[in-house]
Every structure is written in C-alpha cells, then in structure tokens.
C-alpha cells in the first residue's frame, strides 16, 4: 500500500458543496474506491465487469458520485466547518491482477466563502 498526497486538485468547490476527485490509473478495469474522512468510510463505489464485458457499479455506502474512465467524483453538500478534515481516496484494484491498494489524500480547508447558504 502506497500512501501519499494527491498531486492534483482533489477538491472542487461549487454552490456550497464540494466535489472530491479520486483519480485511478486508466489501465484499471475493476476496482473499489472508498472516500475516507479521517479513518471513517463516507462513500464507496465498486466497478466490476461480468461476462460479455458488462459493467456493474455498486455502492454500499452511497453518496452522489460520478464515474469516468480515470476518476470517481464524490459530492458533499451543505458544507460547514465540521467538514474540514483529511480526506483520502482508498483505491483497491482487482483488475489487472494482482490485487493492489493505494491511498491518496489531502486536507479540506473550509473558508467562509465556500459555506452553504451564507448571508450576503
């Protein structure tokens, strides 16, 4: 398992919410991506391929998420100061084999300008 800071912009703010971008290698076909806040699992998304290359997407801990061919985005809404924390993208790779796990993350700073529903 390799742990490190994300070397890309992991947090994208909009409309009082944040998009947390979890990238994965383009060669990866089957995986589980978990979003961790500190040590707690907030969200997860699992992509598997069945016979005939049918793709299955499952979530045990559901968040609004978006899948592309090299990233999973998790969306958190109604930001407040309690959201400030370390967030980690925990990637488990099933395909190509063998199994690999890699963890990347960063600190989410919350500033007044990013909070939801603030009075102008």
């Amino acid at each position: 398992e390799i742990n490190g800071s994300a070397n890309y912009e992991m947090f994208i703010f909009h409309n009082g919410g944040v998009q947390i971008l979890c990238k994965y290698p383009d060669i990866v076909q089957q995986f589980k991506m978990q979003l961790l806040k500190g040590g707690q699992i907030l969200c997860d998304l699992t992509k598997t391929k069945g016979s005939g290359n049918t793709v299955s997407i499952k979530s045990l801990k559901f968040c609004h998420s978006q899948l592309s061919n090299n990233s999973v985005s998790f969306f958190l809404y109604n930001l407040d100061h309690s959201h400030a924390n370390y967030y980690f993208c925990n990637l488990s790779i099933f395909d190509p084999p063998p199994f690999k796990v890699t963890l990347t993350g960063g600190y989410l700073h919350i500033y007044e300008s990013q909070l939801c529903c603030q009075l102008k």
């Epitope: 994300a6 383009d26 060669i27 395909d95």
Partner: antibody
Framework: EVQLVESGGGLVQPGGSLRLSCAAS????????MHWVRQPTGKGLEWVAL???????YYSDSVKGRLTISRENAKKSLYLQMNSLRVGDTAVYYC???????????????????WGQGTTVTVSS | EIVLTQSPGTLSLSPGERATLSCRAS????????LAWYQQKPDQAPRLLIY???TRATGIPDRFSGSGSGTDFTLTISRLEPEDFAVYYC??????????FGQGTRLEIK
C-alpha cells in the same frame, strides 16, 4: 546481489507430484509480486502462475486445479506445488520477480526484471 | 484474451546490420506501458531488455530500442554485435491471463 534460485525439479511419473522452491535474496521479497513461468524444451515461454504481495493467486487455464503457488515471506521463498502431473507439464520452470508499482492514479510496469536459472521438471513413464 | 504474434519467426543477419523485430497484438493494447521485451540465449534464463514499450532496462546497451503503440510494437537493434544473436520475446501485462508472451523471434547469424 539480487538473486532467485530454484530447486525441486526432477523426473516424475504422470499423475505424480512435485514441489518446486525458489529462494530469494538481495531484495525485500515481501514487496514484490512473483510468478512461475515455464519453457518446454525448444519452445517458447508460458506463464504458469502469479502470487501477489497480498497473497492473492492466479493461474493459467492449463494448470488451474493442479498446481498451487504459495509464498513464505519470512523465509523469502516462493513455492509451486505440482499435483496430477501430465507429460505436457515437462519444462524448465523459472521463478520470476515482477516489478510494478501503483501510486495514486499512476500504475507503473517495470517488467519481469529478475529470473532464476530454472529447474527442470520431466514427466514421463 | 490478447494474442501476441511475433515476426519473423527467424531473422538471419550479419554483425553490424540493423535488426527489426515485430510484435503484433490481436487487439489494441490500452497503454504501451504494459509491453516488454526479453532476450534469451541458449541454456540461459530470459533477460529483461525493454519495459513500457520503449524504456531500456538497467544495463542494456543503447543499441537496443523499443517503440510502438496500439497493436504494433517493434524492437530495433541498431548495429548487431555477436552477443546479440539469441531468441527475443515480447510480453504483455494484462487481465486474463495477467502475463502473455509472444512465440519468439530467433535472431541468427547469416
């Protein structure tokens, strides 16, 4: 010096069993995925089995259910338990190190970079 | 399952000449990072030459070069030395199986 040394090959009858061993030295064995690759006399290379750093195992269709790959990290050793052997299993068997790394959204393949000298398995009646 | 086909089966050249070995995949390889080349001399284990389609492994002379993407990959030896006559294999990292080898190209002295 980084080295892989195979042992355990020999002559065995069809249906028999054999256990190959591979002793690793000069590198952190538990940090690498390992393979067995075989080569029948005068023929090409054939992938046999893979064991990951987490202990997960994968096999070629031709050996599935008959051959078992395992590792003992404390002894820096790789094994191949061979059961229900067939004449078609006759080959030189190589122990091979797989150098790859995953870091965030990068997946690096550095090739099968260390090979043992091979051990010969002959299945014949 | 991707099949790798190497050509020619045998290549007869003289020292000092340029050798071009081909490896063709039965379907497009998603990334060239997964292709490698090996050299094998009689009664020896294979030796890694090139990984990532074009990166020379440690200690490999610069007369060896690799190129290609998609379905077509090439190993070039710019000026053959006597010790270069051997069998060459291309290899792919993949899913099922995790490792695939080409059938090999024998490079022999003309």
């Amino acid at each position: 010096e980084v080295q892989l040394v195979e042992s355990g090959g020999g002559l065995v009858q069809p249906g028999g069993s054999l256990r190959l061993s591979c002793a690793a030295s000069g590198f952190t064995f538990n940090g690498y995925d390992m393979h067995w690759v075989r080569q029948p006399t005068g023929k090409g290379l054939e992938w046999v089995a893979l064991i990951g750093t987490a202990g997960d195992t994968y096999y070629s269709d031709s050996v599935k259910g008959r051959l078992t790959i395992s590792r003992e990290n404390a002894k820096k050793s790789l094994y191949l338990q061979m059961n229900s052997l067939r004449v078609g299993d006759t080959a030189v068997y190589y122990c091979v190190r797989d150098r790859r790394a995953v870091a965030g959204h990068y997946y690096y393949f550095y090739g099968l970079d260390v090979w043992g000298q091979g051990t010969t398995v002959t299945v014949s009646s | 399952e991707i099949v790798l086909t190497q050509s020619p089966g045998t290549l007869s050249l003289s020292p000092g000449e340029r050798a071009t070995l081909s490896c063709r995949a039965s379907q497009s390889v998603s990334t060239s990072r997964t292709l490698a080349w090996y050299q094998q001399k009689p009664d020896q284990a294979p030796r890694l030459l090139i990984y990532g389609a074009s990166t020379r492994a440690t200690g490999i002379p610069d007369r060896f070069s690799g190129s290609g993407s998609g379905t077509d990959f090439t190993l070039t030896i710019s000026r053959l030395e006597p010790e270069d006559f051997a069998v060459y294999y291309c290899q792919l990292f993949g899913s099922s199986p995790p490792i695939t080898f080409g059938q090999g190209t024998r490079l022999e002295i003309k």
